[in-house]
């Protein structure tokens, strides 16, 4: 049975040209993480493999940095970066957990961070 919970940074906003950290945290389970994938809609941004570490997709290597932890840092943001991001935790014995973050990239300097929330 999957008992874990993914906590994410939730709905967040950031300024165009700036950076943002996408963060997920898996809790309430003793499952071992074998790999974490970060995806934007249907595009793979990066993976962090338990054995072999971080691999940033060549299409994004100039604007994506690994970490902190199992999170992902997006740099040089553009309005086109607005959208849904998913952290996918592959674990055993539980299976797969998915967290969702919505990022809005704003033209102005009124970007504010949203509240944290949990996905069961």
């Amino acid at each position: 049975m999957m008992t874990g919970t993914i906590e994410t940074t939730g709905n967040i906003s950031a300024e165009k040209g700036g950076s943002i950290i996408l963060q997920c945290h898996l809790s309430s389970t003793t499952a071992q993480v074998t790999q974490v994938n970060w995806e934007q809609q249907d595009q793979l941004l990066a993976i962090c493999n338990a054995d072999l570490g971080w691999h940033i997709s060549p299409s994004f290597k100039d604007r994506v940095a690994p970490g902190p932890g199992l999170g992902l840092t997006l740099q040089s943001l553009t309005v086109n970066d607005t959208g849904e991001y998913f952290c996918i935790y592959h674990t055993y014995p539980d299976g797969t957990y998915t967290g969702r973050i919505f990022l809005e990239v704003l033209e102005s300097s009124v970007a504010e961070h949203g509240a944290r929330f949990q996905i069961p």
């Epitope: 071992q32 074998t34 790999q35 994938n37 995806e39 793979l44 993976i47 493999n49 338990a50 054995d51 072999l52 570490g53 971080w54 691999h55 997709s57 060549p58 996918i88 592959h90 674990t91 055993y92 014995p93 539980d94 299976g95």
Partner: antibody
Framework: QVQLVQSGAEVKKPGASVKVSCKAS????????IAWVRQAPGQGLEWMGW????????NYAQKLQGRVTMTTDTSTSTAYMELRSLRSDDTAVYYC??????????????????WGQGTMVTVSS | DIQMTQSPSSLSASVGDRVTITCRAS??????LNWYQQKPGKAPKLLIY???SLQSGVPSRFSGSGSGTDFTLTISSLQPEDFATYYC????????FGGGTKVEIK
């Protein structure tokens, strides 16, 4: 076609080192991991470890820690496995194998779909 | 480390037989299990990955099932080229293989 071609058989004395090569062709070398697996005569398969051809990170079987080093040369699409302080029980066929999924597929890495032909390493005094 | 136990270690069968090989993990590994075929003097060949997915180019008479700790490889109708040794491999760290099952001609 996609293939891995390994270096030839080796005969070594106890205490020596051996370095086996594995040349990849037919695919983007840096998009996959390379594993090393060995098989002693008449025995089963033993996982030795693996290396990312993208970032060079390695993970070795605990029993081989300190004696094994895996490296890659991306300019020649070649992976190497060096085993030091050889003992008679290191006599085996050594295989390299490619991860069945690329790093960019999103699949969990773990199965190995393309294998080299094997390199026989004999350790004998 | 997670131990993988295959059974039987060997079996005799005839062409056309249905053959089942089992693999048991010492703890749950979800669906992180692969099956390989090896013929004498040759490298292993991937048959099944992620417990039940058929590798491209592998005949459909091969199938895999199971999750958690118990897994099965089935050959629905054994062919002459299927006489070989079969290995399971779990793909959670640190990766380990089962001891193998030799399928021989009866």
């Amino acid at each position: 076609q996609v293939q891995l071609v390994q270096s030839g058989a080796e005969v070594k004395k106890p205490g020596a080192s051996v370095k086996v090569s594995c040349k990849a062709s037919g695919y983007t070398f840096t998009s996959y991991a390379i594993a090393w697996v060995r098989q002693a005569p008449g025995q089963g398969l033993e996982w030795m470890g693996w290396i990312s051809a993208y970032n060079g990170n390695t993970n070795y079987a605990q029993k081989l820690q300190g004696r094994v080093t895996m490296t890659t040369d991306t300019s020649t699409s070649t992976a190497y496995m060096e085993l030091r302080s050889l003992r008679s029980d290191d006599t085996a066929v050594y295989y390299c194998a490619r991860s069945g999924s690329s790093f960019w597929s999103g699949d969990v890495l773990g199965a190995f779909d393309i294998w080299g032909q094997g390199t026989m390493v004999t350790v004998s005094s | 480390d997670i131990q993988m136990t295959q059974s039987p270690s060997s079996l005799s069968a005839s062409v056309g037989d249905r053959v089942t090989i089992t693999c048991r993990a010492s703890q749950s590994i979800s669906s992180y299990l692969n099956w390989y075929q090896q013929k004498p003097g040759k490298a292993p060949k991937l048959l099944i990955y992620a417990a039940s997915s058929l590798q491209s180019g592998v005949p459909s008479r091969f199938s895999g099932s199971g999750s958690g700790t118990d897994f099965t490889l089935t050959i629905s109708s054994l062919q002459p080229e299927d006489f070989a040794t079969y290995y399971c491999q779990q793909s959670v760290p640190p990766r380990t293989f089962g001891g193998g099952t030799k399928v021989e001609i009866k």
